[in-house]
């Protein structure tokens, strides 16, 4: 004979557990129904009556099958440096992620708690490592034969144009200027070794120390002016 299907609430067999989407109520000592996502337990079960569920109120949610007495509050509205990538509904929390040009300096379980602007490399410096959703840009000095004339969080150092006749030689922050004969971008004759970064340590402010274990949030604090990170701008 097929086993009889038990309807909630029911007393479980000794040593057995309640079924999927059921929970064991310690007070009633019965297996009772959980509430579906978007709902919460309005009235807990008894020996004779099952759980009574109710919909979550506005700005609250439950994401899982549950028996919580109150729905969880959705997170606060996204800040100006964030975009809402998932709205608050009865079944899911709001998720805020950093808007373009920013990265997540302090993450939370879903989305981002604190966004920070991506570092911008100033002229003479290029992006050694691009910023990602969770990491900042790394700036390094342009090597001889390369240049960057922009203040940018995306631009790398690019090769100087190779001139038949050079009007103005290029440097770390300026491309070479050729005379009217057409320039090329091919390799310079005899240029067989690697480009070397210009050692410009003495020409720039010392880098602002940044802890390696946690993101810097000094731009949020009411502090006096400090020098920008080397090769970067604070804006």
């Amino acid at each position: 004979l097929p086993a009889q299907v038990a309807f909630t609430p029911y007393a479980p067999e000794p040593g057995s557990t309640c079924r999927l989407r059921e929970y064991y109520d310690q007070t009633a000592q019965m297996c009772c129904s959980k509430c579906s996502p978007g709902q919460h337990a309005k009235v807990f079960c008894t020996k004779t009556s099952d759980t009574v569920c109710d919909s979550c109120e506005d700005s609250t949610y439950t994401q899982l099958w549950n028996w919580v007495p109150e729905c969880l509050s959705c997170g606060s509205r996204c800040s100006s440096d964030q975009v809402e990538t998932q709205a608050c509904t009865r079944e899911q929390n709001r998720i805020c992620t950093c808007r373009p040009g920013w990265y997540c300096a302090l993450s939370k379980q879903e989305g981002c708690r604190l966004c920070a602007p991506l570092r911008k490399c100033r002229p003479g410096f290029g992006v050694a490592r691009p910023g990602t959703e969770t990491s900042d840009v790394v700036c390094k000095p342009c090597a001889p034969g390369t240049f960057s004339n922009t203040t940018s969080s995306t631009d790398i150092c690019r090769p100087h144009q190779i001139c038949n006749v050079v009007a103005i030689p290029g440097n770390a922050s300026m491309d070479a200027v050729c005379t009217s004969t057409s320039p090329t971008r091919s390799m310079a004759p005899g240029a067989v070794h690697l480009p070397q970064p210009v050692s410009t340590r003495s020409q720039h402010t010392q880098p602002t120390p940044e802890p390696s274990t946690a993101p810097s949030t000094s731009f949020l604090l009411p502090m006096g002016p400090s020098p920008p990170a080397e090769g970067s701008t604070g804006d």
């Epitope: 290029g126 790394v138 390094k140 970064p197």
Partner: antibody, heavy 118, light 107 residues
Framework: EVQLVQSGAEVKKPGATVKISCKVS????????LHWVQQAPGKGLEWMGW????????KYGQKFQSRVTITADTSTDTAYMELSSLRSEDTAVYYC???????????WGQGTLVTVSS | DIVMTQSPATLSVSPGERATLSCKAS??????VDWYQQKPGQSPRVLIY???IRYTGIPARFSGSGSGTEFTLTISILQSEDFAVYFC?????????FGQGTKLEIK
Amino acid sequence: EVQLVQSGAEVKKPGATVKISCKVSGYSITDYLLHWVQQAPGKGLEWMGWIDPEDAKTKYGQKFQSRVTITADTSTDTAYMELSSLRSEDTAVYYCAANSATGTMDAWGQGTLVTVSS
Amino acid sequence: DIVMTQSPATLSVSPGERATLSCKASQNVGSNVDWYQQKPGQSPRVLIYKASIRYTGIPARFSGSGSGTEFTLTISILQSEDFAVYFCMQSKSYPITFGQGTKLEIK
């Protein structure tokens, strides 16, 4: 011309720790990010992590994160990669690579063979 | 993780001919792709960075193209010294990942 010279081959027992050095010469180590890349025998390249010697900030690949430590000594222009809890599958050539403002790994060390065997 | 898939695994071409190597990313990586050459017993060396910029000292016969998810390395007139393994690499997001390599061999 920038040059990266790595320490010599190592033979280690399972469970041991290896520390490889990478000496940067020709230019200051702080002008670069230093990456470490693993290449197992007959296999492809696998990124392990990098260090920015300027501020000692590091970034690790998740596969290696719990076992690798990358450090740099700016006074000697040397970067180090330490890999702990070695197992046989860690037998590989390990490369350091310098990353300049072109955004690429433009100079590589000669590689260090690490053999893990009981 | 972003998966970089190179094809073919092995390419047999005669010297003087053109070789075209493909690299596909599992998601959009913009132009954040580099190409490296590795010869037996040697370290890799960069050929192309940012998908299409030829590195200092690299001969003009090497060119790179593509953006988004599809990238190509072309060697216009193969020289004997070009027979090697070629890897593509993406640096759009962490972890940085490499393709499995294409072995370019003499036909």
